[in-house]
Amino acid sequence: TPLGPKWPEPVFGRLASPGFPGEYANDQERRWTLTAPPGYRLRLYFTHFDLELSHLCEYDFVKLSSGAKVLATLCGQESTDTERAPGKDTFYSLGSSLDITFRSDYSNEKPFTGFEAFYAAEDIDECQVAPGEAPTCDHHCHNHLGGFYCSCRAGYVLHRNKRTCSALCSGQVFTQRSGELSSPEYPRPYPKLSSCTYSISLEEGFSVILDFVESFDVETHPETLCPYDFLKIQTDREEHGPFCGKTLPHRIETKSNTVTITFVTDESGDHTGWKIHYTSTAQPCPYPMAPPNGHVSPVQAKYILKDSFSIFCETGYELLQGHLPLKSFTAVCQKDGSWDRPMPACSIVDCGPPDDLPSGRVEYITGPGVTTYKAVIQYSCEETFYTMKVNDGKYVCEADGFWTSSKGEKSLPVCEPVCGLSARTTGGRIYGGQKAKPGDFPWQVLILGGTTAAGALLYDNWVLTAAHAVYEQKHDASALDIRMGTLKRLSPHYTQAWSEAVFIHEGYTHDAGFDNDIALIKLNNKVVINSNITPICLPRKEAESFMRTDDIGTASGWGLTQRGFLARNLMYVDIPIVDHQKCTAAYEKPPYPRGSVTANMLCAGLESGGKDSCRGDSGGALVFLDSETERWFVGGIVSWGSMNCGEAGQYGVYTKVINYIPWIENIISDF
């Protein structure tokens, strides 16, 4: 029997009946055995076929077999109801070998030319399976030349049998207070040859409850308890199961905070598995009763371990733990069934006694000493000498615990001194220097510190003066002895003030003329305003209308008098403003340098002389009455003049204050 080629030789070739293409002889039997490499099969097809036709191909035939199985018995030229000719069919071996047998009987009625066939080895696609057959691989099948391999979906691993996919279903830990777990792929059939372990691990104090839901279908056996696939539930106290079959197991109250669920499957079966819904419970905490004027949130039927509630107070009430305030309050239920914090109170907000108002007073409107939520108080300033700045002085105790004005301010109102009050009214005509009476010049300040000088009180803690008068003390402010509220220069009865800082105008140059001869002294304490101590007003924008040529201003001080000595009593003089050009011309001639009088100066005095300020008056205010507000304001600061005070044709020169309003305001607001 001829053998076909064997692997590893190339597996392809031609087969033909003896004598082909001539007619074949009688009583012939020829056998070919073809062998392909492992993982390959043989493909065979006929290019010519002409054999004697007989019933069931009993006479002449070609038989194709693979292993023990006959693939085909062929005869004739074309197929009939009972006989088969190959035609254009292709034949495939079942494994890697194919047997071909040719036989002819003792006679042929006519000549037959036999057959010609070609064969070749080809790869078997093991991944292709006939309908109804078990798939080659559980999940994915991969064909390759000479073989195949299986792989698995994510979450599975290939079993050592190289075909089954076992679920990677261990190590899952459930830590939520409730949840669901199920067999892999549920409700589709669970995987074979798998061992799954699930853990429920809750905080100590919780107890896990297991409920089997929807459906339960785990492979079982009628006689033996769960020999194939089974589900087991283990706690630190006991084991439940094994479970299998189609009946939903009953609820399991584990009385444990940790549960291990084990699910084991074998290599066969087609079952949908199981689903567990788990919940937990714990020892409940006492039901929280909201304090008066407060409420609990969230409201629950019961509160167990880890549950919490917060307390919120009604508007106007605040959380207090005793005397201590809390912004928020949340209590958490503990494993022993107690709350971790005691219940606070919701107490009515108390803004407390209102702060004292300097130079003012406070009145309880709602009731004597009532300082709780929505209580009203009224601040007012001491009449005559103080006026309230910014707000109306009405404050309400608001829910945040602060006294708040109608404008929403939480700071105290300010009692600002009333400026420009004087006991004196202007005389309207000029006469000689006179002694001041009490209350005439309550802004007058006496400055002692090396020399005698003057100044004017601004607000209740600033003094306006001339730069040249305090220049020597600019770095030693504490050396200035500042006195006010007295008429007599040497009197022991005065109000003492001390300097905190001296601010000299940056444009002033000492011993180089008197341009920008202006300075401010900040006092280290506020002075109490009364009829003898009152600040002077700063000029309004419209003030120039009261300071035209020939308008009368008043200068006051303890400077040199006609007798050549410092005045014992405060003196004053009413003098007219002098035309600026006239004044400039008066100081153009020697010994005065050109440009001595600048636009930052104003001049006042009589052409005939005799009425003037003098040494010792420096820094004092030249004041004017604002007839609209009926308040006195500072128009000039005593600065310089002729060597001989009150000289005819010469005038007193004063720093023009209106030019320095921004400078004054900036320093006072910054410091």
Epitope: H323, K327, R341, P342, F402
Partner: antibody
Framework: DVQLQESGPGLVKPSQSLSLTCTVT?????????WNWIRQFPGNKLEWMGY???????SYNPYLKSRISITRDTSKNQFFLQLNSVTTEDTATYYC???????WGQGTTLTVSS | DIVMTQSQKFMSTSVGDRVSVTCKAS??????VAWYKQKPGQSPKALIY???YRHSGVPDRFTGSGSGTDFTLTISNVQSEDLAEYFC?????????FGAGTKLELK
């Protein structure tokens, strides 16, 4: 972790003012609670001086009200104690503490002496 | 002001003993009482608040009880590190007031 740290001069002359700072880390002083100043005299007697709350409201021991002020700087998470007109009787270790005293600073010792 | 009286300035104990430190308020303070432990050269350390609530990290051998005017701090199974001075505080009303302290020492 909540931490409080006091800082101050150590020595102050009688009649002067005392200023102490408490720096808080690990918790914002505006988030919640009262922030207290407490002092401990030689001999270990403890005295509560006052607090400033999360909202900035203050409460003082009535015995000190005329000369105490507690303020804060929320940007630096600090609160301050100012005690005016100190005398030798104010010599003590000064502590800052949160709420009912769940957290304390390590204390700063103050001596009032000329 | 509410006076907090710790009647015993000193208490002697042995390691392993159970000891109770008491504090009496001159007025009702509800449960607004805290307890502290202080060792020489250290700041006070919180133990108990609201009369019976243990502060976090405090060993459970420390127990607080009482309400109204009478309060007790109990230390069961005294350890050597418990030898210190103990103070009570009422925070029910202004001014907050402390007890004078009770020093726990070895017998």
């Amino acid at each position: 972790d909540v931490q409080l740290q006091e800082s101050g001069p150590g020595l102050v002359k009688p009649s002067q003012s005392l200023s102490l700072t408490c720096t808080v880390t690990g918790y914002s002083i505006t988030s919640d609670y009262a922030w207290n100043w407490i002092r401990q005299f030689p001999g270990n007697k403890l005295e509560w001086m006052g607090y400033i709350s999360y909202s900035g409201r203050t409460s003082y021991n009535p015995y000190l009200k005329s000369r105490i002020s507690i303020t804060r700087d929320t940007s630096k998470n600090q609160f301050f104690l100012q005690l005016n007109s100190v005398t030798t009787e104010d010599t003590a270790t000064y502590y800052c503490a949160r709420y009912w005293g769940d957290y304390w600073g390590q204390g700063t010792t103050l001596t009032v002496s000329s | 002001d509410i006076v907090m009286t710790q009647s015993q300035k000193f208490m002697s104990t042995s390691v392993g003993d159970r000891v109770s430190v008491t504090c009496k308020a001159s007025q009702n303070v509800g449960t607004n009482v805290a307890w502290y432990k202080q060792k020489p050269g250290q700041s006070p350390k919180a133990l108990i608040y609201s009369a019976s609530y243990r502060h976090s990290g405090v060993p459970d051998r420390f127990t607080g009880s009482g309400s109204g005017t009478d309060f007790t701090l109990t230390i069961s199974n005294v350890q050597s590190e418990d030898l210190a001075e103990y103070f009570c505080l009422q925070y029910n009303s202004n001014p907050l007031t402390f007890g004078a302290g009770t020093k726990l020492e070895l017998k």
